[in-house]
Interface confidence: low
């Protein structure tokens, strides 16, 4: 949606021109505008930026093409024929009319817009081979940009790790994206919200279908980027969902309390070889470095396809798999380390944490082993494995007591 920016315009350093796929003068008339307003406009990624003049570095408005529906040629009111200089951009929630100086300019704008939203060069427009070549170059740039583009709240964590992060750092947000655990070329969204006095964790599947991401909800919703996926969740919950941004100060190692086998005391356990943590999120898409140290880690042995199955609640509740199903956010038997605590050794007697809580029990045992992420882990594998074993043991003991 076109939105005037509130902050004062801070010009970029002189000489640093915005890098646009295409730019020209463009007159724009939004749904609330009475007349066309002339801008210098530039297309970059899935956004058209509008400037007061072609000498400006700071845009005054921007228009996101994430909700693109179609482009149509426009015959101005009162005209009997198409002068070739008007076109309409139809987005899911609004229509914006544009006026340009020439037919060639109109076809160029339509061509570049279609190139970025449909990831193809539209050869059916009135364009010259040179224009098509320019669009093919933009297409290559846009495909490369999309391949690297990930929102700040995308973390390479498993389902369990995502849940733990949202529980541990509620002040950092309550929505995160993570790789799809079923090995499919998609992502999953994990959210945590208060519902009837209980924190509820929900998981949603987002399927990758070509260049689109389709959110698997009752009315499947397609988006052109992961950022648009995040926007969908934020806007459809009236901003109750906040993208998760992990501050640099937060610990990247999951520690937990374990009973010392010799003296029965509770001790702090932090695995000695910390796994790579998520990079501190600074807001805005950040490229994933293709050959980061994260990628060089030996891959974890793949588990049988269990990542995306819920831990089966005990009792009559069926095993659930996704889509708008709720899981009460359990207080896992994990004490999370306070902020800024120096990294303790593997065994540290009585760290400054509260007493070990009793696990909130789902009236029974775990239906299946808790999974370990197939992506690079946020938390050390050893720690998770121990925690999983610990959970399993505790719940089995409880089950035995109950029967």
């Amino acid at each position: 949606m076109a939105s005037a920016l509130r902050p004062p315009r801070v010009p970029k350093p002189k000489g640093v021109l915005p890098s646009h796929y295409y730019e020209s003068f463009l007159e724009k008339k939004g749904p609330c505008d009475r007349d066309y307003k002339k801008f210098w406009a530039g297309l970059q990624g899935l956004t058209i930026y509008f400037y007061n003049s072609n000498r400006d570095f700071q845009h005054v408005e921007k228009l996101n093409l994430g909700a693109f529906e179609k482009l149509t040629d426009e015959i101005p009111w009162g005209s009997s024929r198409d002068p070739g200089t008007h076109f309409s951009l139809i987005l899911r929630d609004q229509e914006i009319k544009f006026k340009v100086e020439t037919l060639e300019c109109r076809e160029m704008w339509k061509g570049f817009i279609l190139t970025v939203v449909e990831l193809r060069v539209p050869t059916d427009l009135t364009l010259l081979p040179g224009h098509l070549y320019m669009m093919s170059e933009v297409l290559a740039k846009e495909e490369a940009r999309r391949a690297l583009e990930t929102p700040s709240c995308f973390l390479k964590v498993s389902r369990l790790e995502a849940q733990l992060l949202l529980e541990r750092y509620p002040e950092c947000g309550n929505l995160l994206l993570r790789p799809s655990g079923d090995g499919a070329d998609g992502v999953s969204v994990t959210t945590r919200q208060m519902h009837n006095g209980t924190h509820v964790v929900r998981h949603y599947k987002v399927k990758r279908e070509g260049p689109k991401y389709v959110i698997d909800v009752e009315q499947p919703f397609s988006c052109t980027s992961l950022d648009a996926v995040v926007n969908y969740f934020v806007s459809h919950t009236k901003k109750a969902l906040v993208p998760f941004l992990l501050d640099e100060d937060y610990e990247k190692v999951l520690g937990y309390v374990e009973a010392d086998k010799e003296n029965g005391e509770n001790v702090w356990v932090a695995p000695s070889a910390p796994g790579p943590g998520p990079a501190p999120c600074t807001g805005g898409p950040k490229p994933l470095s293709p050959a980061s140290s994260q990628d060089k880690l030996p891959p974890l042995p793949p588990l049988p396809n269990q990542e995306e199955n819920y831990v089966t609640p005990i009792g009559d509740g069926p095993a659930v798999d996704y889509e708008n199903q709720d899981v009460a956010s359990s207080s896992w038997p994990v004490i999370l380390k306070p902020k800024k605590l120096p990294k303790p050794p593997a065994k540290l007697p009585k760290p400054p944490v509260g007493p070990k809580p009793e696990p909130k029990v789902f009236n029974g045992g775990l239906g299946r082993k808790l999974p370990v992420s197939s992506a690079q882990p946020l938390f050390p594998t050893a720690g998770l494995a121990d925690m999983t074993a610990e959970l399993q043991k505790k719940l089995e003991k409880r089950r035995a007591l109950e029967h």
Epitope: E118, L119, R120, V121, S136, E143, R146, E209, G210, P211
Partner: antibody, heavy 117, light 109 residues
Framework: EVQLLESGGGLVQPGGSLRLSCAAS????????MYWVRQAPGKGLEWVSS????????YYADSVKGRFTISRDNSKNTLYLQMNSLRAEDTAVYYC??????????WGQGTLVTVSS | DIQMTQSPSSLSASVGDRVTITCRAS??????LNWYQQKPGKAPKLLIY???SLQSGVPSRFSGSGSGTDFTLTISSLQPEDFATYYC???????????FGQGTKLEIK
């Protein structure tokens, strides 16, 4: 004149592999997504796979997922379909097609793949 | 996945007849629907795209209508060369995912 010419079909045993090629001429090959569509003898059309203009995005029908791989070489104006672990039900005429703004506007004449022991 | 159901699966008609073939999508596909004609041993030929737009070079006796889930292909006055199999095809999620109807075989009565 627009032309799409498929090749690489033939007789293969179940479990075997074949690589189909589709040579394009007469249009801007890099400018559009490409497809493979197949038609089993006496049956209807079945979409098999798609690839985006630059080759970054690929998509497959469930029936071939994990066995077939679509790719393209824009410098050679050629589309490929690598078919592994072939089954009897993959027997069909395979067409390559190219999309316009709303349509598959160009089709090849097809190449026959027969999977039989 | 979106399913496309064509009816009837076969149809006998005479030259000069008006013929209607319908296609139903399992969910709304707006007007992202194409109609193809296929003759034995040949590649499919596009007749109608975007539900109602006539592909260039296609005779005006062919027309398409509908949007959402229900679509129709009409041949206003059958000609001998129109006896063939007709397929509808959805193109909903942009460029990459297509589903065809099972086809309608149009035969001479």
């Amino acid at each position: 004149e627009v032309q799409l010419l498929e090749s690489g079909g033939g007789l293969v045993q179940p479990g075997g592999s074949l690589r189909l090629s589709c040579a394009a001429s007469g249009f801007t090959f890099y400018g559009g997504s490409m497809y493979w569509v197949r038609q089993a003898p006496g049956k209807g059309l079945e979409w098999v796979s798609s690839i985006s203009s630059g080759g970054s995005y690929t998509y497959y029908a469930d029936s071939v997922k994990g066995r077939f791989t679509i790719s393209r070489d824009n410098s050679k104006n050629t589309l490929y379909l690598q078919m592994n672990s072939l089954r009897a039900e993959d027997t069909a005429v395979y067409y390559c097609a190219r999309v316009g703004y709303d349509t598959m506007d160009y089709w090849g004449q097809g190449t026959l793949v027969t999977v039989s022991s | 996945d979106i399913q496309m159901t064509q009816s009837p699966s076969s149809l006998s008609a005479s030259v000069g007849d008006r013929v209607t073939i319908t296609c139903r999508a399992s969910q709304s596909i707006s007007s992202y629907l194409n109609w193809y004609q296929q003759k034995p041993g040949k590649a499919p030929k596009l007749l109608i795209y975007a539900a109602s737009s006539l592909q260039s070079g296609v005779p005006s006796r062919f027309s398409g209508s509908g949007s959402g889930t229900d679509f129709t292909l009409t041949i206003s006055s059958l000609q001998p060369e129109d006896f063939a199999t007709y397929y509808c095809q959805q193109r909903w999620y942009w460029w990459y995912l297509f589903t065809f109807g099972q086809g309608t075989k149009l035969e001479i009565k």
